[in-house]
């Protein structure tokens, strides 16, 4: 008996977009986060608001291949990278182009993943090795989350479970997705 035959459907979007009460963490990568710091401005400015719903943040599209060892997805996957800046929604998209980007007064808000989508991916392997199926969970939208003095950045990286959350302050800082994510249909196929 071997493994079941793999469907060779390359990538297939799974229609459900679930809401997850504890979304997986997102690596805060300096290359993409571009966080605007206070820049010596006074803590108050005219656009300050207490309502998180009035804030929004930048969603940058990021395309990558899913790989596992020598195997690579037939097609790249696209997801969002949540930029580190949060500002009043009415200023965000248009003002950027005019160079009037709002600078937050201190680290009050972070832009973090909000919703995820699952996508089935077929990984193709060299040398006649059987394909591997994966499900990756990809960031589908971002949100602003208000920080309190008790938060630090790693505490925003809500994982599916506390026990499984990669540890704060440790080296490789995975951008862990609590996902059925790149699921392994691992190397062999029997």
């Amino acid at each position: 008996q071997g493994w079941q035959a793999f469907k060779n459907d390359a990538t297939e979007i799974i229609p459900e977009l679930g809401e997850y009460p504890e979304p997986p963490p997102e690596l805060e990568n300096n290359k993409t986060m571009n966080r605007a710091e206070n820049g010596g401005r006074p803590p108050h400015h005219p656009f300050e608001t207490k309502d998180v719903s009035e804030y929004s943040c930048r969603e940058l599209h990021f395309t990558r291949y899913v790989t596992d060892g020598p195997c690579r997805s037939a097609k790249p996957v696209t997801e969002l990278v949540c930029s580190g800046q949060c500002g009043p929604a009415r200023l965000l998209p248009n003002a950027i182009g005019r160079g009037k980007w709002w600078r937050p007064s201190g680290p009050d808000f972070r832009c973090i993943p909000d919703r995820y989508r699952a996508q089935r991916v077929q990984l193709l392997c060299p040398g006649g090795e059987a394909p591997r199926a994966r499900k990756v969970r990809l960031v589908a939208s971002c949100k602003c989350k208000r920080l309190t003095r008790f938060h630090n950045q790693s505490e925003l990286k809500d994982f599916g479970t506390e026990a499984a959350r990669p540890q704060k302050g440790r080296k490789p800082r995975p951008r862990a997705r609590s996902a059925k994510a790149n699921q392994a249909e691992l190397e062999n196929a029997y």
Epitope: R134, G160, R177, N182
Partner: antibody, heavy 125, light 108 residues
Amino acid sequence: EVQLQQSGAELVRPGALVKLSCTASDFNIKDFYLHWMRQRPEQGLDWIGRIDPENGDTLYDPKFQDKATLTTDTSSNTAYLQLSGLTSETTAVYYCSREADYFHDGTSYWYFDVWGAGTTITVSS
Amino acid sequence: EIVLTQSPALMAASPGEKVTITCSVSSTISSNHLHWFQQKSDTSPKPWIYGTSNLASGVPVRFSGSGSGTSYSLTISSMEAEDAATYYCQQWSSYPLTFGAGTKLELR
């Protein structure tokens, strides 16, 4: 809280059939592969197999292929392990677990991040 | 299938002692495919180290993992009472997924 809740212990007769359940809370099982493991008394862990609740695709360790059947019911967010032809060898704790990944610096990792508390099956006449 | 051989099977360590548990793999695997779990009596295994060297949340920094190819290890820099448990390595390189037989670590 993200959890996998497993059904209670069972005492079963040799040759019988038993069906264990594993119900997920706070996440949709369709977004994760679910795996089952066996742990015999005072022994290590054996992987039984894996199911994709989204489409029912399964993989089994060949040594469990004829003994174990994995199914899911997405409407109740529950996975099932059915064991048939029970013998004393079947006496063990059975765990369900969720497969998750993380991606960092171009590398993907797959691992069991959430485990159920286990269901003890005792086969005895 | 890939066979994982853990050694020692049983060991005892005094508080403050350095502990190393090894996991030998029957064929070469990528380091991102080797994980460690901790299990205490009558409880389910807990994720402990992912991808050879990444500690799960809540795991004390006295734990570390290393290795590549066919040789991997888990190290406790300074043994504490709460570290007494059984540790399993597990590979995610190919199906069937396999675990080591476990190393039972006792407090001396």
